[in-house]
Amino acid sequence: FGISGKHFITVTTFTSAGNIGEDGTLSCTFEPDIKLNGIVIQWLKEGIKGLVHEFKEGKDDLSQQHEMFRGRTAVFADQVVVGNASLRLKNVQLTDAGTYTCYIRTSKGKGNANLEYKTGAFSMPEINVDYNASSESLRCEAPRWFPQPTVAWASQVDQGANFSEVSNTSFELNSENVTMKVVSVLYNVTINNTYSCMIENDIAKATGDIKVTDSEVKRRSQLQLLNS
């Protein structure tokens, strides 16, 4: 490609998190090059012989691909010319975690960057009023988390209050024996107040809010990946 070792291009990666049992994306960008046939993208994983994925001359080359990644990887081919070398990973597994290298060679030069890929499980919590309890309580459930998260409750009215004495949290292993269902019950809740159930591990933080009034129940939930 007429590259001397002196020419380096900027390659940028972002710490990514993969939700096991879903498709994931390992993010990598580079200085664009309109000459698609001159672009080589190689993804490597620390401790793995062979490649995770290779894209060159405008198409995939899987001849050197490691068995662990067969049938599971893809680049966004139509976005390569604009500098997107991100890798799509099908059906993320716990074992996909690790350090990856995104290596790029173009007609302008070459460069690489490492990426720490974390894998785990995270899901939105759902809060419901538990009318079966002797006193009104709230039940916060999230179907899939790993590693085991921490759960905390907060309330708009009693800001800063510690609810650990009036809540009970349990973790139930799911059928695939990796992820767990999170259930937390908050007792003695009062109406006309907004309560929040916060679930967090080193990969993600999820919050479910519920506002209970005499006439209605309003819910909201959000999920945020950490260090991404």
């Epitope: 939700n19 096991i20 049992g21 879903e22 498709d23 994925h53 198409k59 995939d60 899987l62 691909q65 990644f69 067969r70 049938g71 599971r72 990887t73 893809a74 680049v75 081919a77 139509d78 799509r88 099908k90 059906n91 499980a121 899901s123 179907p143 899939r144 799911n174 059928s175 695939e176």
Partner: antibody, heavy 115, light 109 residues
Framework: EVQLVESGGGLIQPGGSLRLSCAAS????????MNWVRQAPGKGLEWVSV???????YYADSVKGRVTISRDNSKNTLYLQMNSLRAEDTAVYYC?????????WGQGTTVTVSS | EIVLTQSPGTLSLSPGERATLSCRAS???????LAWYQQKPGQAPRLLIY???SRATGIPDRFSGSGSGTDFTLTISRLEPEDFAVYYC??????????FGQGTKLEIK
Amino acid sequence: EVQLVESGGGLIQPGGSLRLSCAASGFTVSSNYMNWVRQAPGKGLEWVSVIYGSGRTYYADSVKGRVTISRDNSKNTLYLQMNSLRAEDTAVYYCARDTYAMDVWGQGTTVTVSS
Amino acid sequence: EIVLTQSPGTLSLSPGERATLSCRASQSVSSSYLAWYQQKPGQAPRLLIYGASSRATGIPDRFSGSGSGTDFTLTISRLEPEDFAVYYCQQYGSSPMYTFGQGTKLEIK
């Protein structure tokens, strides 16, 4: 032995409902991408729906809003709830596991929609 | 939506001959996400090739897959009587999540 066995097919009137089941053995349904694929008489294969290990679901446009894919992890079984059935839903319905591709298929169950 | 077009629709060959089946995508498909299946009458499909070129477990080496981008090929180097069937290519990963080609019928000449 890794195996999928479908059941629940039959003759149903247009507008009716049916629930197909797919019992898995030899592997865990909740760890895999599980699909329903159908084949109308004398026609090719048509993808219907998938449920990811995470529980996320996707549907083909032709069935969206009329079918629901689900699973019972404790029974290691995949389901397809079909509502508002039409004549064009007549087909053999297969469940299939997707790892690197659809490597395990059931024998299929026949759904006939007719008045 | 990605459309997969298989050709020819029907291929008439004799045992011992070489069969070449084509699958063309309307837009680029990742090689990793391209698979080939064989289906015989009254039977479920069987995975032959995944990742465009990797043979599935138990598949004889007379079956091979190649191609990338929009053009993929399934080759059967020397046809055996049990190879006469319908063959489908399939892609994963774009909306709709999975797409099958319309199939190629391989029949005995």
